[in-house]
Each structure stands twice: as C-alpha cells, then as structure tokens.
C-alpha cells in the first residue's frame, strides 16, 4: 500500500436546507482507471463511513441506494455533495481515496472537512 | 474501433443455469465497466450489474440477488454474465454495455427459458 | 430504487413536428441520460449527463432539466428518428431505466 496526499478544506457551512458540498483532490502518482471515494465522519472520536463510491473513467459518481451523498469527478477531483444534514450531524467529514486499479493500490486520507450544519429557525407565527 | 461480441443464443429449461460471454476488442478492457442489461420481450431496459474488469470490484441489482454472478477474463478480454435457477420470466435479450455511460453495446444474447 | 417515469408512453408525430418527451424520477439526481433504440438493435446513447449530445448525434436533439424533471427534444422530427427513447439514471445503485416512450408516425 502506498501513501498518497489528499486535500479538502478545512470547513464547510452547509445550507438553510441541510446540503453541504466541498471538493476532494488527490496527488495521483499514475494513471488510474479505478477510483473509490468513501465520506467519513468522526465525531466523538468515533469514525464512521457515510458513504462510499467506486468510478471508472466518467463524471458521476454512483452510490448506494439511500444514500445521502451525490459526487462527480474530473481529473483528480472529487465534487461531494451530503444531504439530508441537521444540526446533530456536525462533525469532521474525511475524504478517503484509494486508487484501486492498475496497481500499486494507492491510499490517502484528507484531514477532514468540518462541516457545520445549522437548523432553520422554525417560522414565526403570524397574524398575518 | 470498439467491438462487443456476445455469445449465441441459448434454450434453456427451468431451473437450469445460462451462462453469456461478451468479448471485448479495439479498447483497453480494464478502463471502462462492463454492464449488463436485459430486454425481455416487448419490454423495456433493465439493469442487471456491473463489473470493474480490472478489479473485479461487481455491483448488481437487488432484484437479481444469488441469481446472478459476473465474472471476467483479462487474459481474453471477456466478461461473463452467469443467471441460474431461470424461470420463463427470465426470456430476453441480455446485453453487454461498456462505461458509464453505455457508449457501445454488444449485438444482444436471446435466452430463451422454455419447459 | 428510484424510479423514472417518462411521459407519454406512446407519441404520434409527423416528420417536421418537434416533439418532447419528459423524465421525472422519484428522487433527485445529478444528470439523467437518454438512449435510442431500434426495432431488434441494441440501444444507443443519445444524450448524457443530461444535456451533452454522444458522438455523432444531430443537433436536432437536445436535453435539459435538473433535480427530479428532465426533458428531451427532437426539434424536428426526421424520419429515421421513429423509435423507442429511454431515460436512465445512475445517481444511485441500481441503476435504473424509464419506461421507454414510443415514437410513432402519424
């Protein structure tokens, strides 16, 4: 396994309607035609895998069904966007890349990305 | 230029197994997935899986779960789709499809699963 | 699953006509994609990433939408474009197909 350099930024607010997209980029030594993206988040020291795609050669990134994230690729960037956030979910979100195929299997790890999420204030009432 | 040829037809009765080819050329085999659709007839498209030629890494559709199993050949630039246990519900015409975005189709397998 | 449902199943139009056909899926994805198919051939990728036309394809088609609604037009028809149209998604696994809509002439 080698080790290979991944970058995210450091925070991301996400919006009034719980979405939250940042990009990931990785250092690839080779050409890969086989490239898995997995989403962590580590909160509490807990780390935990949100969601996780594997693509070949094309821009969409495709998930498992129910899955909160949606991505596209080009070149050696990621576009992750998570969805369905609420305040409780706050937390260091880190961008996993593993370069699977041709080998040598590559590995890296970005610092995170700390997502903020905000619940909306519900409405006032009105008299209006 | 790209071609995919598939396997001939096949009859095959109830319970039985039928096992597709689709030989890839004119491409590097393990740069694009391998899918592979189904068409039963008068009837729309239907996914079946997928497979990453150079890994193996597969995903297929729940639909199909313990029925359906792909494999591939580097050596001879093949993939295999194998169905067992068939029914008369799975007569149709499998298909191969190459990337993600099915840019190129193989000519269709017709399996027909009759008793 | 998310499911696509394109609208109509079934459309009579002449040569000329512009004509649109819609994609709604049950749940938002990044792009949908469409694909042509003749009588006894395999499909053929028209459009993808929703609004990119494939190699080779007459500028007469056209994609648009986002989120949950996507269309495709032909804006007018000719004669070898009388066929069967299918959406597809793959935002998430399994990937999936629309219904297909019949292109008739009138």
């Known amino acids: 396994c080698k080790a290979m350099h991944v970058a995210q930024p450091a925070v991301v607010l996400a919006s009034s309607r719980g979405i939250a997209s940042f990009v990931c980029e990785y250092a690839s030594p080779g050409k890969a035609t086989e490239v898995r993206v997995t989403v962590l988040r580590q909160a509490d020291s807990q780390v935990t895998e949100v969601c996780a795609a594997t693509y070949m050669m094309g821009n969409e990134l495709t998930f498992l069904d129910d899955s909160i994230c949606t991505g596209t690729s080009s070149g050696n960037q990621v576009n992750l966007t998570i969805q369905g956030l609420r305040a409780m979910d706050t937390g260091l979100y880190i961008c996993k890349v593993e370069l699977m195929y041709p080998p040598p299997y590559y590995l890296g790890i970005g610092n995170g990305t700390q997502i903020y999420v905000i619940d909306p204030e519900p409405c006032p009432d009105s008299d209006f | 230029q790209v071609q995919l040829v598939q396997s001939g037809a096949e009859v095959k009765k109830p319970g039985a197994s039928v096992k597709v080819s689709c030989k890839a050329s004119?491409?590097?085999?393990?740069?694009?997935?391998i899918n592979w659709v189904r068409q039963a007839p008068g009837q729309g498209l239907e996914w079946m899986g997928r497979?990453?030629?150079?890994?193996?890494?597969?995903y297929y559709n729940e639909m199909f779960t313990g029925r359906v199993t792909l494999t591939r050949d580097t050596s001879t630039s093949t993939a295999y789709i194998e169905l067992s246990s068939l029914r008369s519900e799975d007569t149709a015409v499998y298909f191969c499809?190459?990337?993600?975005?099915?840019?190129?189709w193989g000519q269709g397998t017709m399996v027909t699963v009759s008793s | 699953d998310i499911q696509l449902t394109q609208s109509p199943s079934f459309l009579s139009a002449s040569v000329g006509d512009r004509v649109t056909i819609t994609c709604s899926a049950s749940?938002?994805?990044?792009?949908i994609h469409w694909y042509q198919q003749k009588p006894g051939k395999a499909p053929k990728l028209l459009i993808y990433?929703?609004?990119t036309l494939a190699s080779g394809v007459p500028s007469r088609f056209s994609g648009s939408g986002s989120g949950t609604e996507f269309t495709l037009t032909i804006s007018s028809l000719q004669p070898e474009d009388f066929a069967t149209y299918y959406c597809?998604?793959?935002?998430?696994?399994?990937?999936?197909f629309g219904q297909g809509t019949k292109l008739e002439i009138k």
């Open positions: 004119g491409y590097t085999f393990t740069s694009y997935w």
């Open positions: 499809a190459i990337g993600d975005y099915f840019d190129y």
């Open positions: 497979i990453a030629p150079g890994s193996g890494t597969t």
């Open positions: 749940k938002s994805v990044s792009y």
């Open positions: 597809q998604q793959r935002t998430t696994y399994p990937l999936t």
């Open positions: 990433d929703t609004s």
